[in-house]
């Protein structure tokens, strides 16, 4: 699986999850998030050669098409597969609130 | 929606579904498919500027991150959203078989 366990341990050029730390205030302009100050959102990148973690029949077909037609511009792309939520603390005035934000952290990637 | 209705009618540079005809024999080397000879598989391509058909909170956050950090290499990618099946006819010996292959045709795209 093209997940953090594999990708963060290997120098993988092809489609894999990459570490990306986002600081809420500096990178997004979000002053309203109290904790954490930032988090590892991660992202997916790298080429999708034929059959690399293909998501659907279409991406498999497209990968094969590219292999046999190297000049083609149509190719699968490396995108998030598994995402996890992030729990944040923010304040409504003086009142603390805890919220779980869905689909905030990329854990693995696929070729789609 | 970044679907064939919209994308095939507009000269859209950003993420959109593009027409791609695949000839089973010539492009894939599949001699076993009798009918059709080929089909419009289509594909997704084009930049994913901030908030263009963002798929998840992560892709929205990543888009915002890119807007505020233009030098960043992490950005959402244009990939298939809705896929449709394709019905094919092939022969097992002299016996015709009809099969529906799932997820063969891209109908719309998203930024993921």
């Amino acid at each position: 699986a093209l997940d953090t366990n594999y990708c963060f341990r290997n120098l993988e050029e092809n489609c894999c999850v990459r570490p990306l730390y986002i600081d809420f205030r500096q990178d997004l302009g979000w002053k309203w998030v109290h904790e954490p100050k930032g988090y590892y959102a991660n992202f997916c990148s790298g080429p999708c050669p034929y059959l690399r973690s293909a998501d659907t029949t279409h991406s498999t077909v497209l990968g094969l098409y590219n292999t046999l037609n190297p000049e083609a511009s149509a190719s699968p792309c490396c995108v998030p597969q598994d995402l996890e939520p992030l729990t944040i603390l923010y304040y409504v005035g003086r009142t603390p609130k805890v919220e779980q934000l869905s689909n905030m952290v990329v854990k693995s990637c696929k070729c789609s | 929606a970044l679907d064939t209705n919209y994308c095939f009618r507009n000269l859209e540079e950003n993420c959109c579904v593009r027409p791609l005809y695949i000839d089973f024999r010539q492009d894939l080397g599949w001699k076993w498919v009798h009918e059709p000879k080929g089909y419009y598989a289509n594909f997704c391509s084009g930049p994913c500027p901030y908030l263009r058909s963002a798929d998840t909170t992560h892709s929205t956050v990543l888009g915002l991150y890119n807007t505020l950090n233009p030098e960043a290499s992490a950005s959402p990618c244009c990939v298939p959203q809705d896929l449709e099946p394709l019905t094919i006819l092939y022969y097992v010996g002299r016996t015709p078989k009809v099969e529906q292959l799932s997820n063969m045709v891209v109908k719309s795209c998203k930024c993921s």
């Epitope: 002053k31 923010y90 005035g93 | -």
Partner: antibody, heavy 120, light 108 residues
């Protein structure tokens, strides 16, 4: 230059519905919490509710809870106020505002306002 | 909800004079959850002071805010003709956000 421009105000009958829009420009729309504030003719200011960007967490004043919905289209840099089951006492100028940064905060930019009149 | 009471309701002064506007909260707001706005007829409110004492960008130095707990003050050191308007205080310590009923500053 930051600008907020409201539209959609109208004369509507009690129990009717209306949707107000607020187009923002001059800043990164998805970085700030946005609020609606209203002002009845000749009266003071009343907070209506807020929405947090991207995650779309919203909260409302008791007077409008269950009837009004705040949403935003980040791609269009637009804030909306959907008003249902309107009452005569909802008659006011409605202002779209940007907060300084926190969820509850001072409001550093205001639109010009749009008038909603609820009358039979 | 937190009730804000502004006084006086109307303040009649002449240009050049010092204006002192009061805002009292029904419960303590701490030291930094109060803002002041100015509103002229037919216009939207304009933020003057936030965090009880911080001036918003572009606000002249003659405007100053002070106070903590339940008692807050907006002071205009020397009134200019364009300062005559209605002034509102706003608390954002607790939900819902509330505003005072306003103080009308008029030319004497």
């Amino acid at each position: 230059e930051v600008q907020l421009v409201e539209s959609g105000g109208d004369l509507v009958k009690p129990a009717g519905s209306l949707r107000l829009s607020c187009v923002a420009s001059g800043y990164t729309f998805s970085s700030n919490v946005m609020s609606w504030v209203r002002q009845a003719p000749g009266k003071g200011l009343q907070w209506v509710g807020y929405v947090i960007p991207i995650v779309d967490i919203a909260n409302y004043a008791d007077a409008v809870k269950g009837r009004f919905t705040i949403s935003r289209d980040n791609a269009k840099n637009t804030l909306y106020l959907q008003m249902n089951s309107l009452r005569v006492e909802d008659t006011a100028v409605y202002y779209c505002t940007r907060t300084l940064g926190l969820v509850l905060d001072a409001m550093d930019y205001w639109g010009q306002g749009t008038l909603v009149t609820v009358s039979s | 909800e937190t009730v804000l009471t502004q006084s006086p309701g109307t303040l009649s002064l002449s240009p050049g004079e010092r204006a002192t506007l009061s805002c009292r909260a029904s419960q303590s707001l701490g030291s930094s959850y109060l803002a002041w706005y100015q509103q002229k007829p037919g216009q939207a409110p304009r933020l003057l002071i936030y965090g009880a004492s911080s001036r918003a960008p572009g606000v002249p130095a003659r405007f100053s805010g002070s106070g903590s707990g339940t008692d807050f003050t907006l002071t205009i050191s020397s009134l200019e003709p364009e300062d005559f308007a209605v002034y509102y205080c706003q608390q954002y310590a607790d939900s819902p956000i509330t505003f005072g009923q306003g103080t009308k500053l008029e030319i004497k």
